[in-house]
């Protein structure tokens, strides 16, 4: 067990041209805070993958207001170290992500707002118990200077915090075969109680008779490098056929449980029992709790009452991410229906609706005919946000209030003459034609293509076909 410690020395503009604008202003004073995420090994994992070695948030720094016209200086930093406790052996190689966050303290609706200012990442080798290592990382135009170290918590010592020390039993020297514990010269290395043959370089134990492996090693005695093991079946074929030096790893060999979790085999895989402060399939997630205030931008922290349980952030509309740190373009979800225009006002979403539609999301198709009467027996027809009247014969106009001239469209064919009539129109056909619209020629022999005209009507008389 031990603690990884991070000391931020400065955060400000990097060297060279293109100095960044100050993140704070007189109108928007702000303050900084930092988040560190640690992962074992030299993995190049996504920023969102679990911080398997642990994570920590700093306190908020002092409030800073930009001096008008002055270049962005190094910004005031929070006091103290960021400390990430680890319960298991220190892996020796690790990846880190350090994020610089800005908390704006202006007149935001809903109080402070947070935004990610810079994120740096790297992969390092580090022995526990060593001196502070200094580092400089750049993110865009920003530069972050920091130091870090890993130290063991008593009684653990050594480069991986796996050796145990105990106070001396005799005042002058350690017992037979036991060395003083550097740098704690007044203590002695505890007697070795690991399984016989357990690799002193790659294995360790916390209970008598066990042999637990550091990352990258496997086998009952932690003597097989994971990368060179060619035993693929759950227990590995015999060494005679594959050249494996030891039986192949079982699900718990090499202890897949991080942070001091204990592994037990299940019929199909393994199960980790995690120590207080860690959770996840492999105890890989560090115990940041709701008390640390991890939810930004008005997010509500749910669960995570103690380090044994995970927290989640329920984000207000408009934000997402595991800590509600990402602003969502809510209009990209196309919430406005029926062609409405979306406006994201920050504190609310507005839809500007097309004619004929209403409602917060333009979801209501207005009844275009409501309260609109069509005169003279016309009927109202809805459509696309406008209404129109289908008028009775002899009437026209938007509301069927205008008396229509049925002859305006010249409906009588072949030179027939049109007469308006109370129930429609009448065509007086030219000689040689007949029909309601004078559309049928009369045959030369006098026979008609249609039934003969009704009695009393000569072919040249006006005809009405109802």
């Amino acid at each position: 067990a031990g603690v990884f410690e991070l000391q931020i020395h400065s955060f400000g503009p990097g060297p060279g041209p293109g100095a960044p604008r100050s993140p704070c202003s007189a109108r928007l004073p702000c303050r900084l805070f930092f988040r560190v995420c640690l992962k074992p090994g030299l993995s190049e994992e996504a920023a969102e993958s679990p911080c398997a070695l642990g994570a920590a948030l700093s306190a908020r720094g002092p409030v800073y207001t930009e001096q008008p016209g002055a270049p962005a200086p190094d910004l005031p930093l929070p006091d103290g170290l960021l400390q990430v406790p680890f319960r298991d052996a220190w892996p020796g190689t690790f990846s880190f992500i350090i994020e610089t966050w800005r908390e704006e303290l202006g007149d935001q609706i809903g109080g402070p707002a947070w935004s990610l200012l810079a994120r740096v990442a790297g992969r390092r080798r580090l022995a526990a118990g060593g001196p502070w290592a200094r580092d400089i990382q750049r993110a865009g135009a920003w530069e972050l200077r920091f130091s870090y170290r890993a130290r063991c918590e008593p009684p653990a010592v050594g480069t991986a915090c796996t050796r145990l020390c105990r106070p001396r039993s005799a005042p002058s020297r350690c017992g037979p075969g036991l060395r003083p514990c550097a740098p704690l010269e007044d203590e002695c290395e505890a007697p070795l109680v690991c399984r016989a043959g357990c690799s002193p370089e790659h294995g360790f134990c916390e209970q008598p008779g066990e042999c637990r492996c550091l990352e990258g090693w496997t086998g009952p005695l932690c003597t097989v490098p994971v990368s060179t093991s060619s035993c693929l079946s759950p227990r590995g074929p015999s060494s005679a056929t594959t050249g494996c030096l030891v039986p192949g790893p079982g699900p718990c060999d090499g202890n897949p449980c991080a942070n001091g979790g204990s592994c037990s085999e299940t019929p199909r895989s393994f199960e980790c029992t995690c120590p207080r402060g860690f959770y996840g399939l492999r105890c890989e997630v560090s115990g940041v709790t709701c008390a640390d205030g991890p939810c930004f931008n008005g997010g509500l922290c749910v669960g995570g009452a103690d380090p044994d349980s995970a927290y989640i952030c329920h984000c207000p509309p408009g934000f997402q991410g595991s800590n509600c740190e990402k602003r969502v373009d809510r209009c990209s979800l196309q919430p406005c229906r029926n062609g409405g225009l979306c406006l994201d006002l920050g504190h609310a979403l507005r839809c500007r609706c097309r004619a004929g539609f209403a409602g917060p999301r333009c979801e209501h198709d207005l009844d275009d005919c409501a309260g609109r009467a069509c005169a003279n027996g016309g009927t109202c027809v809805e459509g696309g946000g406008a209404h129109r009247c289908s008028c009775a014969l002899g009437f026209g106009g938007r509301d069927c209030r205008e008396r229509a001239d049925p002859c305006a469209a010249r409906p009588c064919a072949h030179g027939g003459r049109c007469y308006a009539h109370f129930s429609g129109l009448v065509c007086a056909c030219a000689p040689g034609y007949m029909g309601a619209r004078c559309e049928f020629p009369v045959h030369p022999d006098g026979a008609s293509a249609l039934p003969a005209a009704p009695p009393g009507l000569r072919p040249g008389d006006p005809q009405r076909y109802l």
Partner: antibody, heavy 118, light 108 residues
Framework: QVQLQESGPGLVKPSETLSLTCTVS????????WSWIRQPPGKCLEWIGY???????NYNPSLKSRVTISVDTSKNQFSLKLSSVTAADTAVYYC????????????WGQGTLVTVSS | EIVLTQSPGTLSLSPGERVTLSCRAS???????LAWYQQRPGQAPRLLIY???SRATGIPDRFSGSGSGTDFTLTISRLEPEDFAVYYC?????????FGCGTKLEIK
């Protein structure tokens, strides 16, 4: 402006299920989280739980085993069901909208008194 | 859960006076996620302050909020007759959301 109206029976028998509905007007139910809060006569306000249009819910642990809050986006309504009620559940029940900048309550219904009695 | 304790329980004052109401949290309320409400008899609560110090829409500027961490206050600079009501604080830092039990402001 968002307006909320609670509806449901004012009298429920012990051991039965209390059911209330809140109808939202002046705002889309898809824009906010929606919550229920209660206040026993002469006592403190108690948060019951909330729902988001996506179906996300969160309940007060003291009531979690008995509470269900659901949302009906087509009707712009959300509802509360509280099972196995006792006289201690007698209260004015309020529905409220949760603000878009944090989990506080910016609009409230006028409240409906539910009495648990046989 | 965060327990909010409001004091005093009841306060008798006259119109025109200045009043300060206290809300103390059992644990730190991060990010000033604290709101204040006013409840008049027979009515629903009404939002006054959010983010510990931001006034809600339509709230007169005689109402102001302050504080951080575990100690928060609501101040009414000059009491009007309609201000006599019960005032509640509520934290929205973590679940469960919790209210204080209120301070009743009555006319002396």
């Amino acid at each position: 402006q968002v307006q909320l109206q609670e509806s449901g029976p004012g009298l429920v028998k012990p051991s039965e299920t209390l059911s209330l509905t809140c109808t939202v007007s002046g705002g889309s139910i898809s824009s906010y989280y929606w919550s229920w809060i209660r206040q026993p006569p002469g006592k403190c306000l108690e948060w019951i739980g909330y729902v988001y249009y996506s179906g996300t819910t969160n309940y007060n642990p003291s009531l979690k085993s008995r509470v269900t809050i659901s949302v009906d986006t087509s009707k712009n309504q959300f509802s509360l069901k509280l099972s196995s009620v006792t006289a201690a559940d007698t209260a004015v029940y309020y529905c409220a909208s949760i603000a878009v900048t944090g989990f506080y309550f910016d609009y409230w219904g006028q409240g409906t008194l539910v009495t648990v009695s046989s | 859960e965060i327990v909010l304790t409001q004091s005093p329980g009841t306060l008798s004052l006259s119109p025109g006076e200045r009043v300060t109401l206290s809300c103390r949290a059992s644990q730190r309320v991060n990010n000033n996620y604290l709101a204040w409400y006013q409840q008049r008899p027979g009515q629903a609560p009404r939002l006054l302050i959010y983010g510990a110090s931001s006034r809600a829409t339509g709230i007169p500027d005689r109402f102001s909020g302050s504080g951080s961490g575990t100690d928060f206050t609501l101040t009414i600079s000059r009491l009007e007759p309609e201000d006599f009501a019960v005032y509640y604080c509520q934290q929205y830092d973590r679940s469960p959301l919790t209210f204080g039990c209120g301070t009743k402001l009555e006319i002396k």
